[in-house]
C-alpha cells in the first residue's frame, strides 16, 4: 500500500481541520487507513480520525481540533494497519479555508433593486469574523451568457443590485463564496444557489 | 472531596529502589494529567516528571531521566514513580499534582490545582 | 529550558501594607491572547503548595480577591493589595508552556 498524493489540509479556523490525499490503487479508506494527529503541545493526546473514500483513490479525513490559534501545529501519521505510510505536521494557521456563507436570501420586495442577504459563517467571537470579504455570482439559466461576479468588500453580508441591471422576466440564480485577506485564506466553497424570478418593469415613462 | 495521597517514601541506600505511589480520588483521574514534584531539605520546588491522561505521553526532568518511570494505573485511579539508582541527591519530599485536562485536543490547563501531602525519601548510606 | 527568576528572594510587609512580587521568564509565556503559561503558588511552612494563580491572571477557586495575578510574555507579578498575618510562607511562580516545567527561587513573605 503506497501514499500517491501525500495528504493536503486546510483549517475553517474553527473546529474542522480536512486532509484529503491519495492512494496508489483502490482503498477502502475507512477499513484500511487511519489518521492520527496531535497538537504539539505539553500532555496532548494523539487523536484519531478514520477516513472516507473520496472517489476511488481518494480518501478526505475530517479532524475535530479546537478553536485554532497562530502557534498550534499537528503531527499528522497515516498509518495502514501496523505500518506507517506518511509522516508530516500541519499548521492550521497557514492553511486556512473558510467555511461557506449560509442561508442566501433574495428579497425582490424591495423597490427597484434586487437585495441580497446572507450570514457570516462564524461566530463574532471568532478572528475571521470581522476579516471576511465575499464574491457574489449572479448568473442566469434562461440566459447562458449571463454570468457576473459582485466582490463585497465590505463586512455587512449583503449586496444591492439595481432590478434595472437584470432582464425582466427570467429567472436567476445566485451563490456566495468568502475569504480573508489578513489570514491569507483560500477561497471557501460555493453557498447552495437561490432562484429568484425578476418580475421587475421599469416605469412607463422610462421605456 | 478532589484528594490526592501518596505513599512509598522512605529511607533507601545509593543505588536502591523506590515506587511511590499517588491515589487519586474526587475527580475523574484518567481525564487529567499528572505531575512529580520534590523539593529538598531547605530548597526550593523541583518538577521531576509528568504524565498524560492516557499514560501515552511522558515527559522527565535530565536529572532524574533513565533512572525514574512514571506510570499510571486508571483504574485504580493511582500513579506512579519507580525510582532506580537512587542517589543523594534525590532525598526530598515529593509531591504528586494534578496537573491539566488531556482529553481534549489542546489540553485545558488550570494550574497544578490539587497536590497531596507529600512522601519524604531519604538516599543516605 | 525557560528560566524564571523571581525578585525580591525576601519580603518583609507590615500587615495591611501592599506587596508585589516579580518573576521573569527568559522566553515568552505566551501561547495565544491570554494564555501566558505561568502560575503563583504560596508555600506555608510545614505545608504543601498551593495554587494562587493560573495562565498569568487566574484566580484559583477560594483564593481571596486580594490576590492578583498580571502580566504578560516574559514578565509577570504576583500582587498582594493588604498584607494579612496568614500569607505569610513562600512564594513561587512556575511556567508550564513546556516540559521541564521550571520555578523560580522563591520569595519569602515575612511580616515585620
Known amino acids: 500500500m503506497k501514499v500517491l498524493q501525500e495528504p493536503a489540509c486546510v483549517s475553517d479556523y474553527m473546529s474542522i481541520s480536512t486532509c484529503e490525499w491519495k492512494m496508489g490503487g483502490p482503498t477502502n479508506c475507512s477499513a484500511e487507513l487511519r489518521l492520527l494527529y496531535q497538537l504539539v503541545f505539553q500532555s496532548s493526546e494523539t487523536h484519531t480520525c478514520v477516513p472516507e473514500n473520496n472517489g476511488g483513490v481518494g480518501c478526505v479525513c475530517h479532524l475535530l481540533m479546537d478553536d485554532v490559534v497562530s502557534m498550534d501545529n499537528y503531527t499528522l501519521d497515516l498509518w495502514a494497519g501496523q505500518q506507517l505510510l506518511w509522516k508530516g505536521s500541519f499548521k492550521p494557521s497557514e492553511h486556512v479555508k473558510p467555511r461557506a456563507p449560509g442561508n442566501l436570501t433574495v428579497h425582490t420586495n424591495v423597490s427597484d433593486t434586487v437585495l441580497l442577504t446572507w450570514s457570516n459563517p462564524y461566530p463574532p467571537d471568532n478572528y475571521l469574523y470581522n476579516d471576511l470579504t465575499y464574491a457574489v455570482n449572479i448568473w442566469s439559466e434562461n440566459d447562458p451568457a449571463y454570468s457576473r461576479i459582485h466582490n463585497v468588500t465590505y463586512l455587512k453580508p449583503t449586496l444591492r443590485i439595481p432590478a434595472s441591471t437584470l432582464k425582466s422576466g427570467i429567472s436567476y440564480r445566485a451563490r456566495v463564496r468568502a475569504w480573508a485577506q489578513h489570514y491569507n485564506t483560500t477561497w471557501s466553497e460555493w453557498s447552495p444557489s437561490t432562484k429568484w424570478y425578476n418580475s421587475y418593469r421599469e416605469p412607463f415613462e422610462q421605456r | 472531596e478532589v484528594q490526592l495521597v501518596e505513599s512509598g517514601g522512605g529511607l533507601e541506600q545509593p543505588g536502591g529502589s523506590l515506587r511511590l505511589s499517588c491515589a487519586g480520588s474526587?475527580?475523574?483521574?484518567?481525564?487529567?494529567?499528572m505531575t512529580w514534584v520534590r523539593q529538598a531539605p531547605g530548597k526550593g520546588l523541583e518538577w521531576v516528571s509528568s504524565i498524560s491522561g492516557s499514560g501515552d505521553g511522558t515527559y522527565y526532568a535530565d536529572s532524574v531521566k533513565g533512572r525514574f518511570t512514571i506510570s499510571r494505573d486508571n483504574s485504580k485511579n493511582t500513579l506512579y514513580l519507580q525510582m532506580n539508582s537512587l542517589r543523594a541527591e534525590d532525598t526530598a519530599v515529593y509531591y504528586c499534582?494534578?496537573?491539566?485536562?488531556?482529553?481534549?485536543?489542546?489540553?485545558?490547563?488550570?494550574?497544578?490545582?490539587?497536590w497531596g501531602q507529600g512522601t519524604t525519601v531519604t538516599v543516605s548510606s | 529550558d525557560i528560566v524564571m527568576t523571581q525578585s525580591p528572594l525576601s519580603l518583609p510587609v507590615t500587615p495591611g501594607e501592599p506587596a508585589s512580587i516579580s518573576c521573569t521568564a527568559s522566553?515568552?509565556?505566551?501561547?495565544?491572547?491570554?494564555?501566558?503559561?505561568v502560575d503563583w503558588y504560596l508555600q506555608k511552612s510545614g505545608q504543601s503548595p498551593q495554587l494562587l494563580i493560573y495562565?498569568?491572571?487566574n484566580r484559583a477557586t477560594g483564593v481571596p480577591d486580594r490576590f492578583s495575578g498580571s502580566g504578560s510574555g516574559t514578565d509577570f507579578t504576583l500582587k498582594i493589595s493588604r498584607v494579612e498575618a496568614e500569607d505569610v510562607g513562600f512564594y513561587y511562580c512556575m511556567q508550564s508552556l513546556q516540559t521541564p516545567y521550571t520555578f523560580g527561587q522563591g520569595t519569602k513573605l515575612e511580616i515585620k
Open positions: 522566553q515568552s509565556l505566551l501561547y495565544s491572547i491570554g494564555y501566558n503559561y
Open positions: 499534582a494534578k496537573d491539566r485536562v488531556s482529553i481534549t485536543i489542546r489540553p485545558r490547563y488550570y494550574g497544578l490545582d490539587v
Open positions: 495562565l498569568g491572571n
Open positions: 474526587g475527580f475523574t483521574f484518567r481525564d487529567f494529567a
